[in-house]
């Protein structure tokens, strides 16, 4: 999913059906003055960045696992 500039939300689209084994780390951004929505940005093991749907139960599980493993910020 394309990442926009920091002056607004970064996630224009979210990626569906990503596997936990492909994810290196996850960054979760809370709403702020630049963006009204929660954003989940995954760094994949191949170096690419991908936006995930924060409302998806699968993504919530990924965040929980990453938090346990210390791979989320």
């Amino acid at each position: 999913a394309p990442l926009a500039t920091e002056l607004r939300c970064q996630c224009l689209q979210t990626l569906q059906g990503i596997h936990l084994k492909n994810i290196q780390s996850v960054k979760v951004k809370s709403p702020g003055p630049h963006c009204a929505q929660t954003e989940v940005i995954a760094t994949l093991k191949n170096g690419q960045k991908a936006c995930l749907n924060p409302a998806s139960p699968m993504v919530k599980k990924i965040i929980e696992k990453m938090l346990k493993n210390g791979k989320s910020n």
Partner: antibody
Framework: EVQLQQSGPELEKPGASVKISCKAS????????MNWVRQSNGKSLEWIGN????????SYNQKFQDKATLTVDKSSSTAYMQLKNLTSEDSAVYFC???????????WGQGTLVTVSA | QAVVTQESALTTSPGETVTLTCRSS?????????ANWVQEKPDHLFTGLIG???NRAPGVPARFSGSLIGDKAALTITGAQTEDEAIYFC????????FGGGTKLTVLQ
């Protein structure tokens, strides 16, 4: 279609508290922060604060830190704002407002008139 | 607390271009102030127009655009229409959103 439906008008006595609601529909409630804004004397707007339902985190305008309490009920997709120790200066129309990808204040509720009078 | 100042009223005609501005008491408005523009029509009907200085909200006509002009944030309506008659508020971010007093825009036929 995004909709924010606010509760009806309130008439309260000085010193009382009031809790107003904003029921959201047409989107995934937890993903977007909910702002609260007030309009006094039919003109100026003041930002009260914001509630992030995803992490249950609030941000307040310092002016309203001791006046307003923002909460949500995720199960009913409803945001609430409680105002305490009301004075005549709190008489205003209060709005909830949700953002979009582009802007913080994209979608607004219809407003709730709060009148504080002895 | 910073003060945000707008023109109190402006008048334009259909088809004309009009620019509303938003000044900060703390100095030049920058992209870090994340300027937002909101339209108010009668009966408390609010609609967000612009966020992050120049990002148009969903469904907002292309004639509305946001920018920085000199030391101010600006909302330009290119080819104003009678339905654009409204009050326009800007909001700037400091450590909270601070709204200006609003500009009443009249579109005279």
């Amino acid at each position: 279609e995004v909709q924010l439906q606010q509760s009806g008008p309130e008439l309260e006595k000085p010193g009382a508290s009031v809790k107003i609601s904003c029921k959201a529909s047409g989107y995934s409630f937890t993903v977007y922060g909910m702002n609260w804004v007030r309009q006094s004397n039919g003109k100026s707007l003041e930002w009260i604060g914001n509630f992030d339902p995803y992490f249950s985190v609030t941000s307040y305008n310092q002016k309203f830190q001791d006046k307003a309490t923002l909460t949500v009920d995720k199960s009913s997709s409803t945001a609430y704002m409680q105002l305490k120790n009301l004075t005549s200066e709190d008489s205003a129309v209060y709005f909830c407002a949700r953002g979009s990808w582009e802007t913080i204040f994209a979608y607004w509720g219809q407003g709730t008139l709060v009148t504080v009078s002895a | 607390q910073a003060v945000v100042t707008q023109e109190s009223a402006l008048t334009t005609s259909p088809g004309e271009t009009v620019t509303l501005t938003c000044r900060s008491s703390t100095g030049a408005v920058t992209t870090s102030n994340y300027a937002n523009w909101v339209q108010e029509k009668p009966d408390h009907l609010f609609t967000g127009l612009i966020g992050g200085t120049n990002n148009r909200a969903p469904g907002v006509p292309a004639r509305f655009s946001g920018s920085l002009i000199g030391d101010k944030a600006a909302l330009t309506i290119t080819g104003a229409q009678t339905e654009d008659e409204a009050i326009y508020f800007c909001a700037l971010w400091y450590s909270n959103h601070v709204f200006g007093g609003g500009t009443k825009l009249t579109v005279l036929q």
